[in-house]
C-alpha cells in the first residue's frame, strides 16, 4: 500500500511527524507547492514543544510556516483551527504592514530570528519547513 510508516530520506522524525528543513529560499506559494508534491504541507505548529523543536533546527533564520491570511482570516494549511490553537507572534504582530512598498499587506507567517512569528509579504524568498504525519495505523503497538 501507500502507508507512510517511516520518514523519507533526509527528513527528521519527531512525535510521529516527519519534517524537512530547506537550505534555500522560496516564495510562500512555491514552498507550499514543494511540500505538497512530497505529500506534505508547510509546518503547522500546534504546541510549544513543537515550536521549540522547529526552532532548534532552523536557527535564527526567517522561515515560512503553513499559516496565512490570503483569503481573509488566518488559516493553517492543514485545517487546524487557528483561533483556538497555539500562537507565538512577536509583540504587535501580525500587523499586515503596507509600508514595505511592495504592494498589498502581509499575508504569510514566518519564524523570525528569535523563533517568534511575524507576518510578511508572501513573495519574499524565505526558507521553509515541510511536515507530514506518519500514518495512525503505524502508531499502534504490534499485537502479541
Amino acid at each position: 500500500g501507500s502507508e507512510r510508516t517511516c520518514c523519507p530520506v533526509n527528513w527528521v522524525e519527531h512525535e510521529r511527524s516527519c519534517y524537512w528543513f530547506s537550505r534555500s529560499g522560496k516564495a510562500w506559494a512555491d514552498a507550499d507547492n514543494y511540500c505538497r508534491l512530497e505529500d506534505a504541507h508547510l509546518v503547522v505548529v500546534t504546541s510549544w514543544e513543537e515550536q521549540k523543536f522547529v526552532q532548534r533546527h532552523i536557527g535564527p533564520v526567517n522561515t515560512w510556516m503553513g499559516l496565512h491570511d490570503q483569503n481573509g482570516p488566518w488559516k493553517w494549511v492543514d485545517g487546524t483551527d487557528y483561533e483556538t490553537g497555539f500562537k507565538n507572534w512577536r509583540p504587535e504582530q501580525p500587523d499586515d504592514w503596507y509600508g514595505h512598498g511592495l504592494g498589498g499587506g502581509e499575508d504569510c507567517a514566518h519564524f523570525t530570528d528569535d523563533g517568534r512569528w511575524n507576518d510578511d509579504v508572501c513573495q519574499r524568498p524565505y526558507r521553509w519547513v515541510c511536515e507530514t504525519e506518519l500514518d495512525k495505523a503505524s502508531q499502534e503497538p504490534p499485537l502479541l
Epitope: 501507500s2 530520506v9 534555500s24 522560496k26 512555491d30 508534491l37 505529500d39
Partner: antibody
Amino acid sequence: EVQLLESGGGLVQPGGSLRLSCAASGFTFSSYAMSWVRQAPGKGLEWVSAISGRGGNTFYADSVKGRFTISRDNSKNTLYRQMNSLRAEDTAVYYCAKKDYDYVWGSPYFDYWGQGTLVTVSS
Amino acid sequence: DIQMTQSPASVSASVGDRVTITCRASQNISNWLTWYQQKPGKAPKLLIYAASSLQSGVPSRFSGSGSGTDFTLSISSLQPEDFATYYCQQTDSFPFTFGPGTKVDVK
C-alpha cells in the same frame, strides 16, 4: 531496474478524448511523485503535469489545465493521463517521468523516463 | 512563469573539442537546475541535477556550474556519442519549464 512503459497513444479527432497509461516497475512507486512531459514533433520539451506519490496533490501547466487530468493507481503501479477537448497543438510524444530530488538541497529532477507514446490530434 | 533561455541554439564541434552551453533563468532559481541529453527518437537522459551534481553513470567529462540565474553545462572532450540536443530545466517553481534546447552536431 527501473522501467516506465507508456501506452494509449494514437490518432484522435479535435475535441476528442484519450487516456494514456504509464506502467512502472523496479521501484517503490507510491514513494515517488511522477510527471508527464510532452514534445511536439521537432520541438522542445514541455512539462505538463505532476502528481504526488500518494496521489493527493496534482499540478498542471496552464496549457492543459481544465482539459487534462493526472492520476495514479498505486496498487497497480500505474500513472494515468486523461486528455479531453484535445486540440491540434496537443499533438506530441508524451513521456512519463519519475521524480527524485537532491538530498542536500531538495531540488527535484526527473531521473527515469519512459520511451514515450505519440498522440496525434487531427481530423 | 520562469522563462529559460539557452545559448547557443546549436553548435558544430569535433570529437575532442570542449563544448560549453549556457542556460539563463528569468529569475533567481538558486541551484534548482537540471540538464538533460536527448537523442533523436529517444527519451531525455538525466546528466546533471542541482546545477552541478553528476548523475550516477554519467561520464565525468560532463560538468555543470552556476547558481541564481546563470548556468553552464560543459563537455570537456566531446565524444561521438555526445552529439545530441541538450536541455536545461528549472524545478524551482511550477510550471517546471525547460530551455529551448541546444543541438550539438558534427562540424
